[in-house]
Each structure stands twice: as C-alpha cells, then as structure tokens.
Amino acid sequence: SRLRQEDFPPRIVEHPSDVIVSKGEPTTLNCKAEGRPTPTIEWYKDGERVETDKDDPRSHRMLLPSGSLFFLRIVHGRRSKPDEGSYVCVARNYLGEAVSRNASLEVALLRDDFRQNPTDVVVAAGEPAILECQPPRGHPEPTIYWKKDKVRIDDKEERISIRGGKLMISNTRKSDAGMYTCVGTNMVGERDSDPAELTVFERPTFLRRPINQVVLEEEAVEFRCQVQGDPQPTVRWKKDDADLPRGRYDIKDDYTLRIKKTMSTDEGTYMCIAENRVGKMEASATLTVRAPPQFVVRPRDQIVAQGRTVTFPCETKGNPQPAVFWQKEGSQNLLFPNQPQQPNSRCSVSPTGDLTITNIQRSDAGYYICQALTVAGSILAKAQLEVTDVLTDRPPPIILQGPANQTLAVDGTALLKCKATGDPLPVISWLKEGFTFPGRDPRATIQEQGTLQIKNLRISDTGTYTCVATSSSGETSWSAVLDVTESGATISKNYDLSDLPGPPSKPQVTDVTKNSVTLSWQPGTPGTLPASAYIIEAFSQSVSNSWQTVANHVKTTLYTVRGLRPNTIYLFMVRAINPQGLSDPSPMSDPVRTQDISPPAQGVDHRQVQKELGDVLVRLHNPVVLTPTTVQVTWTVDRQPQFIQGYRVMYRQTSGLQATSSWQNLDAKVPTERSAVLVNLKKGVTYEIKVRPYFNEFQGMDSESKTVRTTEEAPSA
C-alpha cells in the first residue's frame, strides 16, 4: 500500500511505570501510543513476548483497548514467578515501531520469620526496659511498630521511644507489664513477632474487680478479675466460700470467670482471690439468674383450603412458666388456654398453647400472634394463615407423558405421544418450529389421547414438535426433535410405561427462605424401575401460567430449588429419569410461600423516606390490660410504605404522683409488627399511649392517643 501523506509512525505518549504489587492483587502497566494508522501494541517481558487474553481467553493478563496490560491477579509462587520481570510495550504500524521505557514489575514480599524476636524482660518498677526486634525480610523493607496486649503503642508518650528496632520504656510502672508484640509491616500486610513478656514487680492489687450481675438463663456471663503484683499473683475463684464445681466454669487466661450457659443453680456469690508471697486480696460479686419466656415450638405460616382445620403450635418455657395467649392481628379479642369455648367460635387454645381453627373461612386469613408473658419478659411470634379456594388456585395442566426425540426413516410413520391431565381437562394442540401443525396436511392427524401421527415421512418433516396442553388454568408445553433420514427406524418405538421409572412420592417442604425452597421425596414404589436422576417442576400463578423446569439431573432425593421470588406461593412436582425417559409426575406438593424480603436500609432517598413516612396513617386500637402491670397495645396501618423499620410505642403516666411525666418508648423493630406489650407498669394508674412509625432517624405522624388504666388486681379471664 502507498504511503499516505497524513500517516506517521508510532510514538509512545504514555510509558509504563515501575510497580511493586502484592501476590494475588490486580495491577496495570500503562502504555499509550499515537500513530496513523493506529498502531498495534504488544508487550515483552525480559525480551519474550507476553501472552494475553488475545492469545488465550483464559489468560490472567488482558490487553486493554488503550494498550495497557492489565493483570487480573499477580501470579507468584515460591519458585514459579511468571509475572515478575522487566516489561516494555512495543507499538507498530507499517511505518515503523516505537518501544517504551522499561518498567519493572516486582512482587512485594513479607516473610513469616522475624530476624530477631523480642525476648522476655523482667524489671523493677521505676527502672528502664528495652525490647529489641528485627522484622522479617521483605520487599519493600518492612517498618515496625509495637503492640502491648494486642493494642498498638502510642510512642508520643514521653516515657516511650521507638528507635530502629528498639522499644525503650523509661521509668517503668506496674501498668507497663504485659505482652509486647513487634509488628513488621509493608504493603503485603503485617507479621506479628512471638510475644515477649515484660514483668514489673508489684504487690497484689485489683485493676478490675468482679461486679454483681443479673442475667437471663442460658446467657453467658463473665466475672472479670484483673490483678497485678510482684511476683505475679496466683488467682483462684470460689463460689459461696467453696471451691468451684468442675465442668461448668471456664477460667480464661486473664482470669475472667466465664459461664457459657447460666442455670438457676449458678446463682450465688463468686470470690476472686489474688495471692503472692507478699500479700493476698479478695473481691466478690453476686450472680442472679432469671429465665425469660422462650419458644419451644414456634407457629409457622400455613396455607389451608376453605373448610379445613388448622392448628398453629405455640409451646413455651420459662421461669416462671409463661402465660400464653393468642390474638388475630387487628382484633381486640384475646384467646387464652382453658377458656370455655364461645358459642359460634371456631377458635380454641389448648393447655399447651396450640391455636386450632375449625371450618376455615376466607375471613380467617391474616396474621395470628402468639404471646408469652412472665415477670422476666414477654415474647411474641406471628404466623400467617392463607386461605386458598381450590377453584381459584388451580395449577396449569400437567403433561403426564410427552413426546420423545427420535430418528425415523423416510416413508416411515411417526408417533409423537402427548398425554395430559388437569382440571378442567386440557385441550391438546401441536406446533412445528413454533407454528400451528398439522394444518391441511392429510398425512398428519392428532389422535384421541393427543398423540400426533405423521405417515409417509419426508426429509422436510424434520424439526422440533411441541405439544401444548391448554385450559382456563394455564398452558404447559413439551418439545421433541424428529429427525427424518434415509436410514432411520420405520416406526416410532412405543415405550411401555413399564420401561420408565415410577413417579416419586409427593415432595415435602423441609425448609423455606426468601429465594429458595428445600424439597424431599421418596423414589417410585418398590417394583418400579429405578431412577438415575430427577427433574423438578414448579408453578406459581404470579410468575407464569405454565409449569417451569427448575432443576435437572438431580441425583439426590433432597434438593434446594434456588432463584425463587420472595413472598410468592409455589407448587412443585418431581419426575424420575432413566435412560428410556421421564416418569409420570409425582403428586403436587402443598402450596408453599417463600419468605418476604426485608425493606432496603441503605442507599435510600431521604426525601422519599420522609414523604412516604408522612403518608402513613397508624390507627391505634383500645389498649388491653393483661395483668396489673402489663398492657397490650395493637394498631393497624392504612398503607405499608417501602420505608418502615418499625413502630415506636410511646406511653406516659397521666394519674398518680408522676402525672404527665415524660414519654417512655418501646420500639417494635419489625416492619410487619402490629402489637407490643408494655411491661413493668404501675398498678391502678392511667397511661396515655400513642404509636409513631420510624425509619432510621426519620419519624412519621403519631397515631391518635388512647388512655388505659391498669388494674389493682389481675383481671379475671
């Protein structure tokens, strides 16, 4: 080609720079060139051409459009060091080439072994102490700092100086005693030396005494006891003036006494005794153990058809045994165990706290709240009851047996099976390559049960055939490829159902999250052929109007289906696979709803939050006195915006000595919460109560206030 007047040879306008980078980290060597025509760029390391993704798509080096060389991660071993070296970029066009300056790529290094570890030092209080250290070899050369008891030392304190590798403490105090660690650091990271102990002689004294504690049963508790002395005092613990029983207690290196899970028998007085040859000191503290209510069995969300009976379990424990009661969200009515059943009421609570609702109606749908109450606290759990109407929740048709891929001979006969079921009974139609079939072709007919027959096959009959089963509840399709050749079989192999594995059992739901459902099932009944694998199909009215295959080649009878939508009802069925084909489907699972997603907390538009909160209307119901010192507050919300973190229940005394005292708050920190229990109230006192929605620091409008007077004695049931 001729030299064009405006063309010019390459020149490098941005040269690569030396770089030091940690192993495994990304980095870029820059290179930019000008020239006409635009030059091509290649890189060389130590004189050899560098392979990039242009040569091998799996390469960890990428040649960027700008000409820069990008390393996804620096590869560097003890011996193999393919990325370290001296790089140049070369820009070429037909007029010549330009070579950049050399740029070295060095891999930062920090070895593990210290050239000199600090050693233990013993000094008397008031004397100077010197700790020496030489960090590990590294590139760049590491610097050092010191830690005492895992906390970095501030060398601005006038008694402390750090020069080279030496830590010098003048005029030591007993508080200087501890474990000193030298830390070598560079861009790779940090390495800690072996710790060295600095001992400063002293008589036993307490730096930290144990303090009295009140805990809930099963909580961990720690009694601290920090001492110092010269020589180091021995520290031991006693309980109620006796040695500690073995096994229940864990004494840490800093002499902290820890009980992992407290029991009521752990109550008592704990004494820390510090002793050395020059003295003995004792410090004690008491432990009080309370047992708040706890759920043994929580109620769970259930989906039930009209007319059925549902039971929500709610078993609790605590000390004392909690009082359990139920309430439907939005209702003032409380249900207690052993309450005589009201005429026409279909709800009852068993002595163990289970709520049973008979002859389920649509109006029963909603959230049911189980609450447990003791002096040690209160808890509540919510479960949603969804009521389904069998007629409106019909799944789409199910294709029991669909067509199989097959290769047949010219002039042969094809039989493409399609057997479907459903309520209402589906209509079967066929498509070829997505278009209605058979049209007017007399060679093709759809037989009574839906099988497509094509006689006198031609090469042009090759293609993808799709059986579509359609009803008012949706449609389901199944495709197969027909290949017509000179050498195929003359007629379709008619698989007997006995060649196929039996259908698996009804899948059971064993776990549910926002985006997944875990299913388990049993293989087909004994006597049927075994399965080599399974497929799982799913249907959700809110996702599509057809069954979707959500898992293939499943080798086990327990499987977690992922990628589901939150807060969505799904049905599942399972088919078994063997080399001959697919079984009939299993029975459908019970409907299951995935968990709801929590509202987003980060990255929100504050104006939008404030606007939405301002539109929330909270309606406070009449508070209910549960005991002389506890009141239940319930409310409803006209519209639940995206941005709500919870509700602030505000209450104050309006009678008695502290009338119109300041507001006290109780936060219901769950956006879906619609009730709260106020505890530790005064007997026979009137309270004003209101509820306010909130999100982070933003707050919505208060509900109207309600007043309630606590009783002098327990209210009768």
Epitope: K45, D46, E48, V50, V75, G77, R79, S80, D83
Partner: antibody, heavy 118, light 105 residues
Framework: QVQLVQSGAEVKKPGASVKVSCKAS????????MHWVRQAPGQGLEWMGW????????EFPQKFQGRVTMTRDTSITTAYMELSRLRSDDTAVYYC???????????WGQGTMVTVSS | DIQMTQSPSSLSASVGDRVTITCRAS??????LNWYQQKPGKAPKLLIY???SLQSGVPSRFSGSGSGTDFTLTISSLQPEDFATYYC???????FGGGTKVEIK
C-alpha cells in the same frame, strides 16, 4: 490450551542412559518451573527435581544427585530429563509437571514409561 | 528433608460416604500442602493447593483443611468417579506422601 507432551516409551539396558523430553505449549515457558516426578509400578509418586527454564538453574533431592541431568531448549519450549547409570529399579513412568504460581503441580505430561531390563 | 506421612494407606468406602484422609508433616510447613488424585494409567490431577484452596474445575465435595503439621482431605459424599489414589505433597521441599487408595466396599 496449556499442555505438556512427553516423548514415547523407552526400553534400556542396565548401565545405559535415557533422555525424556517434555514439550510445553499454551503458556510462557520461561515463566514457570518444570518438575520431574516418577512412579515405579504399583508404587507412589517420587519427586526427582526441578529446572527453571528462564536461566537453566536446577535442584535435585540427594537421592538423584550425580545421576540426573535436567536441561531445556527455550527456542522449542522443551524440557529434558536424562537419567544415567540405569538400574532395574529405575523402571517407572516418568512425568514432567509445571509448577503454578500457587506452588502446586497444576499441569502434568501424559507420562513416559521407561523399562530397564537386561 | 521434611517427611510426609499419609494415613490410611488404603480404605474401603461406599458411594455417598464421607471420606477423610490425613497427612502429617515431620515439621511445620505452614499451609504449603497440596492434594492430588490419580487414577490407574493416568497422570495425577491437582485437587487442592495451599492446604484449603480448591483448584478450578474440581467438584466442591472435595475440601482441604489444616496448617502446620496436620492436614486433612475430605470428600463429603463419595461418587463413583472418586475411587482412586490420593497423594499429599508439601510444596516447600516438594516431597509426596505415600498415597491413600480409596476402594469400593
């Protein structure tokens, strides 16, 4: 793609030498150490040493020093392992293997069977 | 030289079993340990490097753990294709363990 291809099987007499080649392709030959490992029939893996293709440096365990030579030809991206003064207990499959930047042998040759028999 | 001791030398197991193989170094090798699988007539294949990192393309049922002198290779649910011999290798001095043959029970 990245691969190592070794020379074919050899039959040698005791006292002779054998030279096995290992042709590397699909990566920068000089960027990765090459190791040799052998496996006698029914036995485990035995490391024989390495060569740095960049500069020809080598290292061998005590057992093989003086009997094994490792070389390379960067122009044809090939490594060689020569074992001299062969004995019957040198009968084994000899493998070359590339050492990755993660200090492991990530790519192996297909192996070369060397039989030493009188 | 740092010696590598692998145990057991062989074991019988069934498909679906959890299998554990151990490897002990005669002195600390930090996390410089690799695991390989070898099938008869084939070259070894890298499974785990740096004691616990899974090599690209290796099924997640294989896992490695340990540091210092004691290391473990675990196959969480043995598959038919997993019956083979497994070797540990320390990447400081590059010596291999004696191997563990996993056979069908």
């Amino acid at each position: 793609q990245v691969q190592l291809v070794q020379s074919g099987a050899e039959v040698k007499k005791p006292g002779a030498s054998v030279k096995v080649s290992c042709k590397a392709s699909g990566y920068t030959f000089t960027g990765y150490y090459m190791h040799w490992v052998r496996q006698a029939p029914g036995q485990g893996l035995e490391w024989m040493g390495w060569i740095n293709p960049k500069n020809g440096d080598t290292e061998f365990p005590q057992k093989f020093q003086g009997r094994v030579t490792m070389t390379r030809d960067t122009s044809i991206t090939t490594a060689y392992m020569e074992l001299s003064r062969l004995r019957s207990d040198d009968t084994a499959v000899y493998y070359c293997a590339r050492e990755s930047g993660d200090d492991a042998f990530d790519i192996w040759g297909q192996g070369t069977m060397v039989t030493v028999s009188s | 030289d740092i010696q590598m001791t692998q145990s057991p030398s062989s074991l019988s197991a069934s498909v679906g079993d959890r299998v554990t193989i151990t490897c002990r170094a005669s002195q600390s090798i930090s996390s410089y340990l690799n695991w390989y699988q070898q099938k008869p007539g084939k070259a070894p294949k890298l499974l785990i490097y740096a004691a616990s990192s899974l090599q690209s393309g290796v099924p997640s049922r294989f896992s490695g753990s340990g540091s210092g002198t004691d290391f473990t290779l675990t196959i969480s649910s043995l598959q038919p294709e997993d019956f083979a011999t497994y070797y540990c290798q320390q990447s400081v001095g590059l010596f291999f363990g004696g191997g563990t043959k996993v056979e069908i029970k």
